[in-house]
Interface confidence: low
């Protein structure tokens, strides 16, 4: 039978690092949208009203907790009138996949903050990323919020040959072992093992010994 | 009247980004969409990708995983990156507009204005 | 994805002919992302029709747009020597936009 005209489809979240936002199609017509988004209480919550907009910022509302399962809806009204209804009394409007931000936000792109070099050892730090989850005022990192289901995975290479190495760490640092002399280069990975979908993140941008994030110390 | 002017980097070598951008004179971003169509040589149009003012983007899937579109309001431009470009990826890239246009209570969408287009090659 | 299919490839008329040109969906469009634009060798496209039948500005009344659902036409109701060029039919409504194949308008 095909969506009714005016009604939005393929509802999509799109989540990195818990900055969430609801994505639909198609562009409006003669109506406008309003996302519905439901709390804890399963209370629906009105967000991005009367907008001709295909995608509404949901993050306020997912990071009051990461953990929670949330739907959305996307309510259509005719242009110019918010209160306007269908044939039924209400609103044409279509359900959201339900979103658990804590199992599905995907993993941003780790940066290397830096790393240093102490005779044939090499402390290598990644950036723990801010995240929009607030806890006391404060925004929380992506080690606040994870913990020790956050793994890093470090790739590193000799920069004058291709043969890679890995190491894994809980933490935000690894400490490996190099060869006296040679530089190396460096990418790392964000990884969730816990997870069932969007386990890792894109790897970081490769970092290499020689330039100016490192130090070295005999 | 609105005039879109575009530059950038007309030869590449393959695995290089691609990166053009588009200048609004004589209006706002505001209101709009703006996007980035391309043309290979002897070849129809194919969409790439629209941001919004406010920056929000739709990308064509085909080439999401490449395409990063971005706005600068204070400048009143738009740009487009193209990631590890080949030889596929020659063509005449043309910024638009993309109007919604309001219409006896409907909205419409269309690319009114365009830019006069930059020949991108990419050969080894 | 909206596949629109463009026919005929090519259209060899005589200035002063009629022009028909159609424009087929792979699924329903709404008629209001439905466009039709105006190319001409080494230029960037020009918009002659949005909402499948509105002219833009500036486009003489010879052009017209018609057409719903799948099915969409542009008619030139006669050919001045400008109007060789080629056309494309535009979806601006689901991602990814899209754009037909093209006719291209000939001199016979």
């Known amino acids: 039978a095909g969506t009714p005209p005016g009604k939005a489809f393929n509802l999509t979240w799109i989540s990195t690092d818990f900055k969430t936002i609801l994505e639909w199609q198609p562009k409006p017509t003669n109506y406008t949208y309003t996302v519905q988004i439901s709390d804890r209480s399963r209370n629906w919550k009105y967000k991005c009203t009367g907008t001709t907009d295909t995608e509404c910022d949901l993050t306020d509302e997912i990071v009051k907790d990461v953990n929670w399962t949330y739907e959305a809806r996307v309510l259509s009204y005719p242009a110019g009138n918010v209160e306007s209804t269908g044939s039924a009394g209400e609103p044409l409007y279509e359900n959201s996949p339900e979103f658990t931000p804590y199992l599905e936000t995907n993993l941003g792109q780790p940066t290397i903050q830096s790393f240093e070099q102490v005779g044939t050892k090499v402390n290598v730090t990644v950036e723990d990323e801010r995240t929009l989850v607030r806890r006391n005022n404060t925004f929380l990192s992506l080690r606040d919020v994870f913990g020790k289901d956050l793994i890093y995975t470090l790739y590193y290479w000799k920069s004058s040959s291709s043969g890679k190495k890995t190491a894994k760490t809980n933490t935000n640092e690894f400490l490996i072992d190099v060869d006296k002399g040679e530089n190396y280069c460096f990418s790392v990975q964000a990884v969730i093992p816990s997870r069932t979908v969007n386990r890792k993140s894109t790897d970081s941008p490769v970092e290499c010994m020689g330039q100016e994030k490192g130090e070295f110390r005999e | 009247q609105v005039q879109l002017q575009q530059w950038g980097a007309g030869l590449l070598k393959p695995s290089e980004t691609l990166s053009l951008t588009c200048a609004v004179y004589?209006?706002?971003?505001?209101?709009?969409?703006w996007s980035w169509i391309r043309q290979p040589p002897g070849k129809g149009l194919e969409w790439i990708g629209e941001?919004?003012?406010?920056?929000?983007?739709r990308y064509n899937p085909s080439l999401k995983s490449r395409v990063t579109i971005s706005v600068d309001t204070s400048k009143n431009q738009f740009s487009l990156k193209l990631s590890s470009v080949t030889a596929a990826d020659t063509a005449v890239y043309y910024c638009?507009?993309?109007?919604?246009?309001?219409?006896?209570?409907?909205?419409?969408?269309?690319?009114?204005?365009w830019g006069k287009g930059t020949t991108v090659t990419v050969s080894s | 994805e909206i596949v629109l299919t463009q026919s005929p490839g090519t259209l060899s008329l005589s200035p002063g002919e009629r022009a028909t040109l159609s424009c087929r969906a792979s699924q329903s469009v709404s008629s209001s992302f439905l466009a039709w634009y105006q190319q001409k060798p080494g230029q960037a496209p020009r918009l002659l029709i949005y909402?499948?039948?509105s002219r833009a500005t500036g486009i003489p009344d010879r052009f017209s747009g018609s057409g719903s659902g799948t099915d969409f036409t542009l008619t030139i109701s006669r050919l001045e020597p400008e109007d060789f060029a080629v056309y494309y039919c535009q979806q601006a409504g689901v991602v990814p936009y899209t754009f037909g194949g093209g006719t291209k308008v000939e001199i016979k």
């Open positions: 909402g499948a039948y």
């Open positions: 638009a507009r993309d109007t919604p246009y309001y219409y006896e209570g409907g909205y419409y969408y269309y690319m009114d204005v």
């Open positions: 004589g209006g706002s971003l505001s209101g709009y969409y």
């Open positions: 941001i919004g003012a406010s920056g929000s983007t």
